[in-house]
Amino acid sequence: FYDIETLKVIDEEWQRTQCSPRETCVEVASELGKSTNTFFKPPCVNVFRCGGCCNEESLICMNTSTSYISKQLFEISVPLTSVPELVPVKVANHTGCKCLPTVPRHPYS
Amino acid sequence: FYDIETLKVIDEEWQRTQCSPRETCVEVASELGKSTNTFFKPPCVNVFRCGGCCNEESLICMNTSTSYISKQLFEISVPLTSVPELVPVKVANHTGCKCLPTVPRHPYS
């Protein structure tokens, strides 16, 4: 009815789009909620974050397990009072993902 | 002054976060602007899209060249008038990216 090879290609495509940890570029300052007078060089780091598709539109690809990776970055404060400092920055790294439904907010929260 | 090895690691991290085409999961129906009574199986495909960091906050990682990839998918229209049809779907695939300044919208547009 449908060509078996085509179906195989489609299935492989589907497997690759599934919700899973994917290498993502994350902006450190916004990730850490730092004030605008603190910035980092480089401003971004590579970590794994959950992404991809779920087979129901109402489900969301969410992290089920997380590790924290330490990245060495230059922290620069403005106005420059001292030389840029090399600091270890801990960034969340998603190690497990799952398509999950949303839970209603508590009506009184 | 700074350990050469550490600087090398930081530089490599920075290179990897640079604005470039990255494999991304794209929802086909919303990509094509289809109505909610047309959907695809699988609902998502893998293509390359521009992503990553720019070294100035005012710049945006944007595509400078695009190709169109044809993906074989099942198109399902509701109400179901026929069996799901295998159709070639053309999806934009970013082949070149650049950090570009945002163009201000015309105040009267």
Epitope: E57, S58, I60 | P42
Partner: antibody, heavy 117, light 112 residues
Framework: EVQLQQSGPELVKPGASVKMSCKAS????????MHWVKQSHGRSLEWIGY????????YYNQKFRDKATLTVDKSSSTAYMQLNSLTSEDSALYYC??????????WGQGTSVTVSS | DIVMTQTPLSLPVSLGDQASISCRSS???????????LHWYLQKPGQSPKLLIY???NRFSGVPDRFSGSGSGTDFTLKISRVEAEDLGVYFC?????????FGGGTKLEIN
């Protein structure tokens, strides 16, 4: 044509358990979640939970977490629901339902469970 | 849990009349993705429920155009423009935005 064929009626004793089946055909079994719903007194519908046949991931309504266990057999495109420690409260009609991308779209014919001593 | 309240409980109509069923949710059904997962099902006597309308206003496969859905947020309506004998049964609204998925108590459409 999408079809969900459920197993026949069950008459069981209180405290026992029951395992019902739902055989899917007419579509790619692993591409769609399978939900289960309980209908009692011919009217009230309660959602039990769902299973993703692709990877076996399950999600249960808190109320049924200790009552129901959802499983699948991919080779036969069949979903199963086991109910344990049955009481008269569990007497009802149980449906398996395929979840389309937007909504639960196709329902099985239902499996009737009667708990009686 | 989100409570779905349907009115009326019973709706006697004459064939050819318009019928209107209301469904109210205890919380907004707007998902964080912007969609509203409010669906309508019809259960005819001795049968399993069948999907009629999905995502507020989209008719499912094979559903006649005399059926229409509308509403937003917490208030939704199913309308049947000209009731036919085959439309009789119990109508349920259901929300698929949050877990647990919940259903309305049903509205029985019967002949006057």
């Amino acid at each position: 044509e999408v079809q969900l064929q459920q197993s026949g009626p069950e008459l069981v004793k209180p405290g026992a358990s029951v395992k019902m089946s739902c055989k899917a055909s007419g579509y790619s079994f692993t591409g769609y979640n399978m939900h289960w719903v309980k209908q009692s007194h011919g009217r009230s519908l309660e959602w039990i939970g769902y299973i993703d046949p692709y990877n076996g991931d399950t999600y249960y309504n808190q109320k049924f977490r200790d009552k129901a266990t959802l499983t699948v057999d991919k080779s036969s495109s069949t979903a199963y629901m086991q109910l344990n420690s049955l009481t008269s409260e569990d007497s009802a009609l149980y449906y398996c339902i395929r979840a389309g991308y937007y909504a639960m779209d196709y329902w099985g014919q239902g499996t009737s469970v009667t708990v009686s001593s | 849990d989100i409570v779905m309240t349907q009115t009326p409980l019973s709706l006697p109509v004459s064939l050819g009349d318009q019928a209107s069923i209301s469904c109210r949710s205890s919380q907004s059904l707007v998902h964080i993705n912007g969609n509203t997962y409010l669906h309508w099902y019809l259960q005819k006597p001795g049968q399993s429920p069948k999907l009629l309308i999905y995502k507020v206003s989209n008719r499912f496969s094979g559903v006649p155009d005399r059926f229409s859905g509308s509403g937003s947020g917490t208030d939704f309506t199913l309308k049947i423009s000209r009731v036919e004998a085959e439309d009789l049964g119990v109508y349920f609204c259901s929300q698929g935005t949050h877990v647990p998925r919940t259903f309305g108590g049903g509205t029985k459409l019967e002949i006057n």
